[in-house]
Interface confidence: medium
């Protein structure tokens, strides 16, 4: 298709020349001579306009041949015509003098719409009203060949598709060619067929790669703002669906009481900075886009946007910062159409205190700067969570102010690794920091390969962690799985429309914040014969580090008065402790922690309780009394022995039964088991009778016992 006319991204002209034109007017392809035969059928198209001879405009009927060709609006010469689509020279009779006096010209401009779906050609007649009375139609014939071969042959007529162009007014017609996305890089072949009053004008063959003819939609979201350094930032976003980067043309005008300036800039970014902005000025801006790195067509201009600056400009207008930092505000002040010289500007805080002159800087004739050092946290004043910073002249302050938000970002993050070493839970609270409306807080972290080897710093590569607010007001974030020996550097980021602040970072090694599982198999007993509280336990499986143990023990009851005992021998599994009451129930709990002091104490184990049981033989037998009944003159008397049950601390810890030992000179020694009774009566018949009361428990009989000897004569004693 090397003989088709390559469509340019700018407007070009279809001209049909009167017969007195010579071939010199045409730009011949290399290698073709001027006397190339018209009958070759490849280089020009002859048009035969047939007008009705009855028309009042028409006289001097004659036969005329028109040469139709394309001329770029950036080209003085005319491209040589290709053949009509049937490959035949088309000669026709002209019944009008009009075409001998005026060139038949059409302006044509084509582009691919920004949505990359429709290829559009606009055909504008330069005859203006000349064809209005004739049946004026425009058709576009097109083909998207499957495979492009480097061949001068034209596709057959049957392969072309025809679209009817919409001529809303006769002078301008719109032709729409649908282009599949897959074919945007292919070559589209087209030609125009213009009919008017029975006359057919047919253009040479045109070729185009749609992707090279994209006319983007206008840029979107055009807006302006004053930057922190006092420039006007014009920003926009590129239209959607454009498959390549764009360049942009920005035109803006500045209108103030002192100056009017206009500018036109081409940029590849989606923003432009305008310096030296003035207070009390208006800026009108438009922007359009075009392909950056190849051919294309400028989009239409965006809708104009106007930005008006106030009489006092603060930059930045608001600052969000953290306690201890230094910040600066700048201001330009216009009063009664005159800019206040910067050396006359004074600064006030909350209209209550004048900021010392030592904190001012004259940046330029019109720009004043104030700096605040080592800032303290902003104290809320009613509903205001900021300090108002005013730029004033010597006599009065403008009602506009800048806003200063100072936040204490010292947020403590504490982490704990579970006893199974499978997850690390980190907690933090915002109760220490002043809440900022519409701010979000996020825990961010960076995991180093191993250890917390370097001082914690905010790493440029970090990840956010989801944290959830708990009922106690703390946020909780869970890391799972964990790398026990990796250093997790973490901090809280406060995100706000004014910027973001980071709390001081902290580095946590999961291995160093383990809260072990509590010791298991905790047992408590009072040892037999020795009489000590023996506590035993098993250490948890994790962590593998050496552990220290804490034991708490106390008399079981509603409110246990705990006593503490610490064990630093990691191998130890039991301990025996003296207790004052061997016959009481003791509650015992054990917990553990790494011996090197890192991490946390485990929870206390479930309590173990001692069981009250006999530890030793009773310390002594019961103290007893006797009652003697009977005739004082008789040799036989009834003796009743009475005693109180032994107390626990004497019986160690119980009495199963009492035994009475008797001794007489005649009958010798014998014993009587009285069970757990505390009263015993026997018959005293001999001169001397000795009795001893023994207390018996599961260990044995009391060793230290009371005894009583009865002998005559004796009176009744109570």
């Amino acid at each position: 298709f090397n003989l088709s006319y390559p469509i340019t991204p700018w407007r070009f002209k279809l001209s049909c020349m009167p017969p007195n034109s010579t071939y010199d007017y045409f730009l011949l392809p290399a290698g073709l001579s001027k006397n190339t035969s018209n009958s070759n059928g490849h280089y020009e198209t002859a048009v035969e306009p047939k007008f009705n001879s009855s028309g009042t405009h028409f006289s001097n009927l004659s036969k005329t041949t028109f040469h139709c060709c394309f001329r770029s609006e950036q080209d003085r010469n005319c491209s040589l015509c290709a053949d009509n689509i049937e490959g035949k020279t088309f000669v026709s009779t002209v019944n009008s003098l009009v075409f001998q006096q005026i060139d038949a010209n059409w302006n044509i401009q084509c582009w691919l719409k920004g949505d990359l779906k429709l290829f559009i050609c606009y055909v504008e007649s330069l005859f203006k009203n000349l064809f209005r009375n004739y049946n004026y139609k425009v058709h576009l014939l097109y083909v998207l060949p499957e495979v492009l071969e480097d061949s001068p042959l034209v596709p057959q007529k049957g392969s072309f598709q025809m679209v009817h162009c919409n001529c809303s007014v006769h002078e301008c017609c719109e032709c729409l060619v649908p282009v599949p996305t897959a074919k945007l890089n292919d070559t589209l072949l087209m030609c125009l067929k213009i009919t008017s009053g029975g006359v057919i004008f047919q253009s040479p063959l045109m070729s185009v790669q749609p992707i090279n003819m994209v006319k983007p939609d206008p840029p979107l979201g055009l807006h302006m703002e004053i930057t922190d350094d006092g420039n006007l930032k014009i920003s926009w976003s590129s239209p959607p669906l454009v498959p390549f980067p764009l360049q942009y043309q920005v035109k803006y005008s500045e209108n103030s009481t002192t100056v009017i300036r206009e500018a036109d800039k081409i940029v590849s970014a989606t923003s432009l900075l305008v310096d030296s902005i003035l207070p009390g000025s208006s800026y009108e801006v438009q922007v359009r886009g075009k392909r950056l790195d190849g051919p294309g067509i400028w989009s239409d201009w965006s809708t104009p946007r106007v930005f008006t600056t106030q009489d006092v400009i603060y930059f930045p207008p608001k600052i969000l910062t953290s306690v201890g930092s230094n910040v600066s505000f700048h201001c330009i002040y216009k009063k009664e159409n005159k800019i206040v010289p910067s050396k006359e500007i004074v600064w006030w805080m909350n209209l209550a205190e004048k900021i010392p002159q030592s904190q001012y800087d004259v940046v330029s004739d019109h720009v004043s700067k104030v700096t605040f050092f080592n800032l303290n946290e902003t104290k809320p004043r009613g509903k205001f969570t900021y300090d108002a910073v005013y730029c004033c002249n010597e006599h009065e302050c403008h009602h506009r102010y800048a806003e200063l938000y100072v936040i204490d970002v010292n947020i403590n993050i504490s982490c704990e690794t579970d006893g199974y070493l499978t997850k690390m839970t980190c907690r933090w609270s915002t109760s220490t920091i002043q809440s900022l409306a519409e701010s979000t807080l996020q825990l961010r972290y960076h995991r180093s390969s191993l250890y917390c080897s370097d001082i914690p710093s905010i790493h440029p590569i970090s990840e956010p962690k989801d944290c959830y607010l708990q009922s106690d007001g703390f946020y909780e974030c869970i890391f799972q799985p964990i790398f026990l020996l990796s250093g997790y550097t973490m901090w809280i980021r406060i995100n706000h429309s004014l910027g973001s602040l980071d709390s001081p970072p902290t580095c946590v090694l999961p291995d160093s914040v383990v809260k072990p599982l509590p010791p298991s198999s905790v047992k408590a007993e009072i040892t037999i014969n020795i009489g000590l509280l023996k506590i035993s336990w098993e250490k948890p499986v994790f962590p593998e580090n050496n552990l220290q143990f804490q034991i708490r023990y106390g008399l079981s009851g509603k409110e246990v008065q705990w006593k503490m005992y610490e064990v630093y021998d990691a191998k130890s599994k039991s301990v025996s402790l003296p207790v004052p009451d061997l016959c009481a129930v003791y509650a015992v709990q054990v917990r553990c922690k790494r011996l090197d002091g890192l991490g946390y104490w485990s929870n206390w184990s479930n309590p173990a309780y001692t069981v009250v049981m006999d530890i030793k033989v009773p310390m002594r037998g019961p103290e007893f009394w006797r009652i003697i009944n009977g005739d004082t003159m008789k040799k036989e008397k009834n003796v009743t022995l009475l005693w109180k049950p032994l107390m626990k601390n004497d019986s160690l810890c119980s009495v199963q039964r009492y035994v009475i030992n008797h001794h007489t000179s005649c009958n010798g020694t014998w014993s009587e088991d009285v069970g757990n009774h505390t009263k015993f009566t026997f018959l005293w018949t001999e001169q001397a009778h000795t009795v001893t009361v023994l207390a018996i428990n599961s260990i044995g009989a009391s060793v230290a016992n009371f005894n009583l000897t009865f002998s005559w004569p004796m009176s009744k004693v109570n």
């Epitope: 180093s448 390969s449 191993l450 250890y451 917390c452 080897s453 370097d454 001082i455 790398f483 020996l485 090694l509 160093s512 890192l598």
Partner: antibody
Framework: QVQLLQSGGGVVQPGRSLRLSCAAS????????MHWVRQAPGKGLEWVAV????????YYADSVKGRFTISRDNSKNTLYLQMNSLRAEDTAVYYC??????????WGQGTLVTVSS | EIVLTQSPDTLSLSPGERATLSCRAS???????LAWYQQKPGQAPTLLIY???TRATGIPDRFSGSGSGTDFTLTISRLEPEDFAVYYC?????????FGGGTKVEIK
Amino acid sequence: QVQLLQSGGGVVQPGRSLRLSCAASGFTFSSYGMHWVRQAPGKGLEWVAVISYDGSNKYYADSVKGRFTISRDNSKNTLYLQMNSLRAEDTAVYYCAKGYENYFDYWGQGTLVTVSS
Amino acid sequence: EIVLTQSPDTLSLSPGERATLSCRASQSVASNYLAWYQQKPGQAPTLLIYNASTRATGIPDRFSGSGSGTDFTLTISRLEPEDFAVYYCQQYSASPLTFGGGTKVEIK
């Protein structure tokens, strides 16, 4: 520029002790983890121990655990390695190294420790 | 622990030639936490590459590192006379930190 100057090497009998020192300059010593790495004669490199920037965390290779102690004095910009119960297999050139994420961006000149009866 | 195996033990090449040194890990090195060092006789090692492929400050661009997971490579595109030395790889993704056995690059 960063410098790590080592001292304390020498010949020592098995079972005895030795303390190596490493004086740092040219960087903020208290901001970085520090390591000891050793190299037995004619052999490759072996990591020995690390201490975190503030001294709160210390980790050791299994071969020296319980015998060697790494420590630092940030006020003196000095790193130490206390080596007890030395064995013949501890004979090596010992290097102190500045850690950065646990690779070693600067090394001392090395000091030879010979354990021999 | 992660065991690093370097190959070959010795590489005999001439100045101007390309050197390719291999380091294979017994298990995956997380986040490509692997470094390469050069050591000349009687000197301390010098850091060449960290994070598997990032050149340390002041290291010529003829040194490059690549690889991930368990297989890593140090390439010296054109050997200079001062490049003949022993090269060690080191992983710092798991405790304990471990080094490869080293590859000696000697003049042919």
